[in-house]
Amino acid sequence: FRDCAEVFKSGHTTNGIYTLTFPNSTEEIKAYCDMEAGGGGWTIIQRREDGSVDFQRTWKEYKVGFGNPSGEYWLGNEFVSQLTNQQRYVLKIHLKDWEGNEAYSLYEHFYLSSEELNYRIHLKGLTGTAGKISSISQPGNDFSTKDGDNDKCICKCSQMLTGGWWFDACGASNLNGMYYPQRQNTNKFNGIKWYYWKGSGYSLKATTMMIRPADF
């Protein structure tokens, strides 16, 4: 299976971890598939929920992925880049705050450039409840990590804010920042940020980034 949409269409309609195959390759990767939300078939490419996984990782770790697909994890930039360059994908970002509120941003077009172009993110067609302005800069920026500084700031955003992300200078979001528990989650410049929903100092409780073919 190339993605969770193919898994779903094959008759596997239960949430869980499935083995996916890189496009035009025999290389495999394990991903969590959400088969219930919004019609199912979603490939989860990022999840934060409890702070159990360190997201201050190297370029190579963000490239190949890390964490546990059943919990907090990053699927891997290389797989997502290859997948989203095969056909048109949508990206849905689901957010939870500490007060029991939920919101989402849906981008009707999403792809990552190749590693040669630093896995630059490309997003179009924003809708949703998490802000009418995109908290990920448009047009997208190159991906940066603590050992791969590609942002637009002399300050090295990934080291300052922690985590790998498509930093601008440094920008209005970072879903891979430090995880702060409840009552420690405000006035944190390096937390899990989605500015156009909760502002600059609020660190979120949970985030999920998921992709699905646009023609699903």
């Epitope: 048109r88 077009h109 792809y111 450039s113 630059r120 179009k124 995109s134 448009q138």
Partner: antibody, heavy 121, light 107 residues
Framework: DVQLQESGPGLVKPSQSLSLTCTVT?????????WNWIRQFPGNKLEWMGY???????SYNPSLKSRISITRDTSKNQFFLQLNSVTPEDTATYYC??????????????WGQGTSVTVSS | SIVMTQTPKLLLVSAGDRVTITCKAS??????VAWYQQKPGQSPKLLIY???NRYTGVPDRFTGSGYGTDFTFAISTVQAEDLAIYFC?????????FGGGTKLEIK
């Protein structure tokens, strides 16, 4: 710096084919983004015609779909417009331009200087 | 196709004035709207994209705003070199479509 340059005949006879070339320097057309043709009619109305993406996929304006083709020569870093069965209504200034997005229509950040084409017998 | 209705067609202003141009989309264009400037004898130049993002090197007197169907472009203090035609463009859905243009003339 990215530069685009259109070239081709300035006069085409009705019912013939219009062929234009866009030569790109400063960026590989196979790296990223989409590479577009836009035309501007007398009176300044702009019309997007179509693109070829870095991956080679194409998208065309439905109003032209039956008579337009966009191709490329990656070795020369060029892409091409062919418009068949032209009429005087195809008289316009033709621009090539780069999109800010690679897989879909988008705003265009780099434009050629344009080439004027007249369709007349 | 989404129709972009741009108003006004002509703006006659003095240097130092603030000007506003509007574009109304026939259906939602999300924030996928750009604004271009075309000076006489030149090709269009991108000024604003994703409704409100200023393109690299564009002076901050040029601003854009809007979401959905209503979009606004403004020049806070018009200068003589701003003499041009300004176009909006939606690229939310294919084919991308342009407004009819606003010609800015300096008194």
């Amino acid at each position: 710096d990215v530069q685009l340059q259109e070239s081709g005949p300035g006069l085409v006879k009705p019912s013939q084919s219009l062929s234009l070339t866009c030569t790109v320097t400063g960026y590989s057309i196979t790296s990223d983004y989409a590479w577009n043709w836009i035309r501007q009619f007398p009176g300044n109305k702009l019309e997007w015609m179509g693109y070829i993406s870095y991956s080679g996929s194409t998208s065309y304006n439905p109003s032209l779909k039956s008579r337009i083709s966009i191709t490329r020569d990656t070795s020369k870093n060029q892409f091409f417009l062919q418009l068949n069965s032209v009429t005087p209504e195809d008289t316009a200034t033709y621009y090539c331009a780069r999109s800010t997005f690679g897989h879909y229509v988008s705003s265009m950040d780099y434009w050629g200087q344009g080439t004027s084409v007249t369709v007349s017998s | 196709s989404i129709v972009m209705t741009q108003t006004p067609k002509l703006l006659l202003v003095s240097a130092g004035d603030r000007v506003t141009i509007t574009c109304k989309a026939s259906q939602s264009a999300s924030n996928d709207v750009a604004w271009y400037q075309q000076k006489p004898g030149q090709s269009p130049k991108l000024l604003i994209y994703y409704a409100s993002n200023r393109y690299t090197g564009v002076p901050d007197r040029f601003t854009g705003s809007g979401y959905g169907t209503d979009f606004t472009f403004a020049i806070s203090t018009v200068q003589a070199e701003d003499l041009a035609i300004y176009f909006c463009q939606q690229d939310y859905s294919s084919p991308p479509t342009f407004g009819g243009g606003t010609k800015l003339e300096i008194k």
